[in-house]
Amino acid sequence: SIPWNLERITPPRYRADEYQPPDGGSLVEVYLLDTSIQSDHREIEGRVMVTDFENVPEEDGTRFHRQASKCDSHGTHLAGVVSGRDAGVAKGASMRSLRVLNCQGKGTVSGTLIGLEFIRKSQLVQPVGPLVVLLPLAGGYSRVLNAACQRLARAGVVLVTAAGNFRDDACLYSPASAPEVITVGATNAQDQPVTLGTLGTNFGRCVDLFAPGEDIIGASSDCSTCFVSQSGTSQAAAHVAGIAAMMLSAEPELTLAELRQRLIHFSAKDVINEAWFPEDQRVLTPNLVAALPPSTHENLYFQ
Amino acid sequence: GAMGQEDEDGDYEELVLALRSEEDGLAEAPEHGTTATFHRCAKDPWRLPGTYVVVLKEETHLSQSERTARRLQAQAARRGYLTKILHVFHGLLPGFLVKMSGDLLELALKLPHVDYIEEDSSVFAQ
């Protein structure tokens, strides 16, 4: 049966049998800035081009043991959520991965900046169709990272990022706080904000919308056919990147403002239990859960 | 995220140092009264002191970025400090990434074309 997260973002008409928009997102390239990935996993083989870009800090700790499957875990799962054959949102989207996070899931602002610059240069050298950049990472507020995101957005690139898993105001983190970036918080199958250990999804006025981010089934780097459940605002952001890819594939001329407006328009409204958020943040936090456009747009989104 | 709202630095730390046109004979000294600012991550464990992103003013050309980076290295060397230019940015933001002692920040903030300097910091998978 269809995983809960795909059901949640799917218009009712498409829930009958299985989630399968045959060519969703095929005109769009999604850049993923994350860990290394297992690009020949059955779920994503042929869909992800691993670029030669790598800018990561050394792993912490003298006894750190670099295990390939662990190094690839986060990125492989997210690539699967965006474009996986069976558990992906935009099954037609092609992806390019840049390694900016090490085997412990840690990177630097400077490495991320250089990665964003790499994408801009690639765009200039070989202009393609619409570009979506997925940034499933967060650090403290960074003026320079936000500025780079702003420049890339002004160059016509759609940036989607994780709100952060700190149960805190997303405005205190980057790139979540960058106004031009689509910032995504995480909700669960009960439309509750996701709790992650003692923390959970970030919130506040810098969040644009929420998306499924708990117990998300996706490609596991443990083996070439394995699946695993992961949770976090990265998974939520990956859903929105997939939805954005499908929207842009259907309407390649959409501006960032129009895309943002459509994402909000088609979202489920007022389904999130706001009691989870601090009282002063409830009015500031958007009560929106991302979804694909309804069946009236069949010709556009499910061609 | 969330367009149409003012930028809020939260508890982001900003240290403003007024530029002074003094030593080192700055051939391209900045206009009087402009300031370059220094920024670092408010979350101490995430800071990466010793690596800095020097962001130059918007219209700065690549050749000027390279020249500014070389100038910083030369001025640092005169003070007995080793520096390493790790990357020169162009395409998105003009500037460069430099590995250097924090002692050189005041010097770096006085360089021509400098808009602001940010200490590198960590980001994490979410």
Partner: antibody
């Protein structure tokens, strides 16, 4: 263009081993593994397993477990399939194909096991 | 796991349409979006005709189409031509491996 070129035909005695090679070209190697499929005379296709160019990981069909070994050599863009303790019912055409999707196939290698 | 079930043979006249079925279980055909169809002429390597249930690789005639309902996938060939005479195999993911159908011999009368 994307191509998989296999080694030539082999005749082996029962109990011996055979190693078939498959040289890949025209695409990004690490984006796909290699599947191995065999076809006995007059029979259908049988998936034998898969091997990764990215990290050398393997996924063998249950029937093959223990008797077969699949490897890759990224430096020469070549995948290998070795089958040990050959029996007469291993006589077949052995194909390599790109990835699990098997969208591109090698020309096939005939392996005859006969005393 | 056992092979997917296909009819041993089907036939049709030039210009007609034929459909080949491929029946599995919820653990293979019914559980995945990844059913493929291959055409194999005698003495040749198989050729991919349909992938991921409905998609046609570039270069494959639009006379070939795929579909799926529940645990059964189907390949339809419209406007039969003499060169379509061949063996056809379906293939599906299973949880950890891949499984082929037994094959269907298509005869163009």
């Amino acid at each position: 263009q994307v191509q998989l070129v296999q080694s030539g035909a082999e005749v082996k005695k029962p109990g011996a081993s055979v190693k078939v090679s498959c040289k890949a070209s025209g695409y990004t190697l690490t984006s796909y593994g290699i599947s191995w499929v065999r076809q006995a005379p007059g029979q259908g296709l049988e998936w034998m397993g898969w091997v990764s160019f990215y990290n050398g990981n393997t996924n063998y069909a249950q029937k093959l477990q223990g008797r077969g070994t699949m490897t890759t050599d990224p430096s020469t863009s070549t995948a290998y399939m070795e089958l040990r303790s050959l029996r007469s019912d291993d006589t077949a055409v052995y194909y390599c194909a790109r990835g699990y999707g098997m969208d591109v196939w090698g020309q096939g290698t005939t392996v005859t096991v006969s005393s | 796991q056992s092979a997917l079930t296909q009819p041993a043979s089907v036939s049709g006249s030039p210009g007609q349409s034929i459909t080949i079925s491929c029946t599995g279980t919820s653990s293979d055909v019914g559980g995945y979006n990844s059913v493929s169809w291959y055409q194999q002429h005698p003495g040749k390597a198989p050729k991919l005709m349909i992938y991921e249930v409905t998609n046609r690789p570039s270069g494959v005639s639009n006379r070939f189409s795929g579909s799926k309902s529940g645990n059964t996938a189907s390949l339809t060939i419209s406007g039969l031509q003499a060169e379509d005479e061949a063996d056809y195999y379906c293939n599906s993911y299973t949880s950890t491996s891949m499984v082929f159908g037994g094959g269907t011999k298509l005869t163009v009368l």
